[in-house]
Interface confidence: medium
């Protein structure tokens, strides 16, 4: 998606099938207010962006309302009347689900069930990562709904958990983004803790699908 024309790099993120963010990096036009023009139907007139992102006082992107769309965004980035980048992209290729909300933990001896609110659209994976201070790496389990049961935990150990949502690659394509991680929560003996002693700082989430 970062194809260049006249040295313009673009990035598209479709946040939760609600908002499309198109950002550009155009070194040749770094001190210029480029304008963003778009349409959702190929035979309509272009509209101009009304919600620009700014970087160092100049336009660097646009936010568009695009509720629950699976069609094409046609757009043109212009310097005055001169198009410097024109393209069309399938928005859903660049889906980034929202971070899990209302995460809850239900303990049953050596097992925990992690639940959260399912998003309003399907073909998603809900991934829980967890570790204790004795683990060298995060363990992971994922399910098609936000109802993930992890068994075989040591009731005496403290565990850190976090959750994210991923679009299924075989449905949405290879270029989607995982959601941001939920906040880390720590549990021991079925009770929430402020932290797990000696737990390293959680790694940055990998962008691999």
């Amino acid at each position: 998606q970062g194809g260049a024309a006249e040295g313009v790099q673009i990035q598209i993120i479709y946040f939760n099938l609600e908002t499309v963010q198109v950002t550009w990096n155009a070194s040749k036009y770094s001190r210029t207010n480029l304008t963003f023009h778009y349409r959702f139907n190929g035979d309509e007139a272009y509209d101009q962006c009304t919600n620009y992102l700014l970087q160092e006082g100049h336009t660097s992107g646009c936010l568009l309302d695009a509720e629950q769309r699976d069609d094409i965004l046609y757009f043109s980035i212009r310097n005055g009347t001169h198009p410097v980048f024109t393209a069309s992209r399938w928005m859903v290729y660049y889906l980034k689900p929202s971070s899990p909300k209302h995460v809850r933990f239900s303990w049953h001896q050596d097992a925990v069930t992690v639940t959260c609110s399912d998003l309003s659209y399907g073909d998603l994976l809900y991934e829980v990562q967890y570790r204790s201070p004795f683990d060298t790496e995060w363990q992971s389990k994922q399910e098609n709904t936000c109802n993930v049961t992890i068994e075989g935990l040591d009731a005496e150990k403290c565990y850190s958990f976090w959750v994210r949502v991923k679009a299924m690659e075989d449905v949405y394509g290879p270029d989607t983004y995982p959601s941001d991680w939920s906040e880390v929560t720590c549990w021991q003996r079925g009770e929430i803790r402020d932290a797990c002693a000696e737990t390293p700082t959680p790694p940055k989430p990998k962008l691999s699908k």
């Epitope: 139907n41 629950q68 699976d70 073909d123 075989d170 949405y172």
Partner: antibody, heavy 119, light 107 residues
Framework: QVQLKQSGPGLVQPSQSLSITCTVS????????VHWVRQSPGKGLEWLGV???????AYNPAFMSRLSITKDNSKSQVFFKMNSLQADDTAIYHC?????????????WGQGTSVTVSS | DIQMTQTTSSLSASLGDRVTINCRAS??????LNWYQQNPDGTVKLLIY???RLHSGVPSRFSGSGSGTDYSLTISNLEQEDIATYFC?????????FGGGTKLEIK
Amino acid sequence: QVQLKQSGPGLVQPSQSLSITCTVSGFSLTTYGVHWVRQSPGKGLEWLGVIWRGGNTAYNPAFMSRLSITKDNSKSQVFFKMNSLQADDTAIYHCAKKSYYGYHAMGYWGQGTSVTVSS
Amino acid sequence: DIQMTQTTSSLSASLGDRVTINCRASQDISNYLNWYQQNPDGTVKLLIYYTSRLHSGVPSRFSGSGSGTDYSLTISNLEQEDIATYFCQQANTLPWTFGGGTKLEIK
């Protein structure tokens, strides 16, 4: 399970219009788009157009001037209308459910409506 | 428009055979290639999407491969119910276009 059932006339007079209704079950039109494809002995399978889940449409440029696809989400119905039919529009017309958002496959097809254009 | 060509319009094979059907695009379609089966009664089913991914419920004897402009569908162990016409479809660029079909018959 997913089903698409088509209803429409078998015979259309030349220069008249064709209307077909595709009634779907097993999925919501607010979640998946519906494509229209036709098949004739002379031209094989031709993609005609699609109505996306949000209601926008995309048409094959070869048919854009005489094609309209609309829908009623609450009735789970998609409506296909083609104007100014001629003999070479004689074909079997199919509606098909879009599957796999990122890959544009047509995962489930209607049974087809056989249309003959003749006076 | 992208032209899709299936050079073999009909193919004879015996039950149990391994059968390969080819499809060529007039330009690179970046693996956005789907395969459909049309049975003698006219019903159409999706078999494979994105070159090699099996649609749900499709038997594993079907497989797909290819890249760029050249793609193929393979049936590893031909069964009676596979006697049908097979179409490729490119989904890289609108308007979507189909190959002319390959009719599979029993020897």
